[in-house]
Amino acid sequence: FKVATLYSLYVCPEGQNVTLTCRFFGPVDKGHDVTFYKTWYRSSRGEVQTCSERRPIRNLTFQDLHLHHGGHQAANTSHDLAQRHGLESASDHHGNFSITMRNLTLLDSGLYCCLVVEIRHHHSEHRVHGAMELQVQTGKDAPSSCVAYPSSSQESENITAA
């Protein structure tokens, strides 16, 4: 299976909410013994490999933000911990996997990584990740709402705030 990032860059004004999204697709083993562990973390653009470094998102680690469920089951974090930090990760039936960040501040700017790990009998088999950048802007140059720039082309799309 693979992970695709719908947008490689999100530019948002301070105070706005944003939903960063990844989609995982390809041959998914729907056997009872296979589940998927999905999570988010911050990183930096490493010289060797993007997403190799793991940093927390608003003090929450990738363990705090994880979802662990069957192939295309819907799920979301019910952790009070995440919601207290203005975060929620979610996954739908179509392979979309997202994290919503509320009330953005300049400190939220940076590189974000989504990670999907295929688990069989509680042990990892394959892992893939996707990366995207979030720029939070303030002042007169800031957009009025979040703008997302697609990964595959230079066109931009306005996206509705979560």
């Epitope: 009872h32 994880h66 509680h122 042990h123 990892s124």
Partner: antibody, heavy 122, light 112 residues
Framework: EVQLVESGGDLVKPGGSLKLSCAAS????????MSWVRQTPDKRLEWVAT????????YYPDSVKGRFTISRDNAKNTLYLQMSSLKSEDTAMYYC???????????????WGQGSSVTVSP | DVLMTQSPLSLPVSLGDQASISCRSS???????????LEWYLQKPGQSPKLLIY???NRFSGVPDRFSGSGSGTDFTLKISRVEAEDLGVYYC?????????FGGGTKLEIK
């Protein structure tokens, strides 16, 4: 401090049913996979069931498959083991245990409860 | 099922001595992802089991460095470099590389 406290153990007749509970505290219960392990009177340990953090995936050995059901209530920080069609060979001390994992890859049971005794006898 | 065989069944030692416990699996427990999921647990009298070693050789936090694990494939060893009174109890190896997960029969460490 991580604490796991089992309850519900009892003396039951063969063919009967019993539900064990394991109350968890001192950690974010919904972030961890959990298992039940039993210890027979001859002190042998046997893995009984495992459930992932969200409760969507369970696994059992053939010896209990179809008779035992592991479940969890993350809102109540509680793990359960529903046992039915009990046999004399199910007589054991039942422990709940928390898994340590990295990215969903379970690699150890690092915390165990004190156990709950189940006796199956006519 | 993977059969885990421990030896000896009973190991009498003097305090301060080195102790060595063997665990053999009926087939290789090297997982397809490259990890070997072999753990060691100690159960002291009247207590529940406690984790000592995971993935063959990694000590769990708080476990003294006199405990060490080694091995690969089908042969594994737990060594205690200088046995202390608090080390007495039954030691179990446990594999989760293949389902069903299986324990060894246990080795009782006792004072000579």
């Amino acid at each position: 401090e991580v604490q796991l406290v089992e309850s519900g153990g009892d003396l039951v007749k063969p063919g009967g049913s019993l539900k064990l509970s394991c109350a968890a505290s001192g950690f974010t219960f919904s972030s961890y996979g959990m298992s039940w392990v039993r210890q027979t009177p001859d002190k042998r340990l046997e893995w009984v069931a495992t459930i992932n953090s969200g409760g969507s995936y369970t696994y059992y050995p053939d010896s209990v498959k179809g008779r035992f059901t592991i479940s969890r209530d993350n809102a109540k920080n509680t793990l359960y083991l529903q046992m039915s069609s009990l046999k004399s060979e199910d007589t054991a001390m039942y422990y709940c245990a928390r898994h340590e994992d990295y990215e969903g890859d379970y690699y150890a049971m690092n915390y165990w409860g004190q156990g709950s005794s189940v006796t199956v006898s006519p | 099922d993977v059969l885990m065989t421990q030896s000896p069944l009973s190991l009498p030692v003097s305090l301060g001595d080195q102790a060595s416990i063997s665990c053999r699996s009926s087939q290789s427990i090297l997982h397809s992802n490259g990890n070997t999921y072999l753990e060691w647990y100690l159960q002291k009298p009247g207590q529940s089991p406690k984790l000592l070693i995971y993935k063959v050789s990694n000590r769990f936090s708080g476990v003294p460095d006199r405990f060490s694990g080694s091995g690969s494939g089908t042969d594994f060893t737990l060594k205690i470099s200088r046995v202390e009174a608090e080390d007495l109890g039954v030691y179990y190896c446990f594999q989760t590389s293949h389902v069903p997960w299986t324990f060894g029969g246990g080795t009782k460490l006792e004072i000579k």
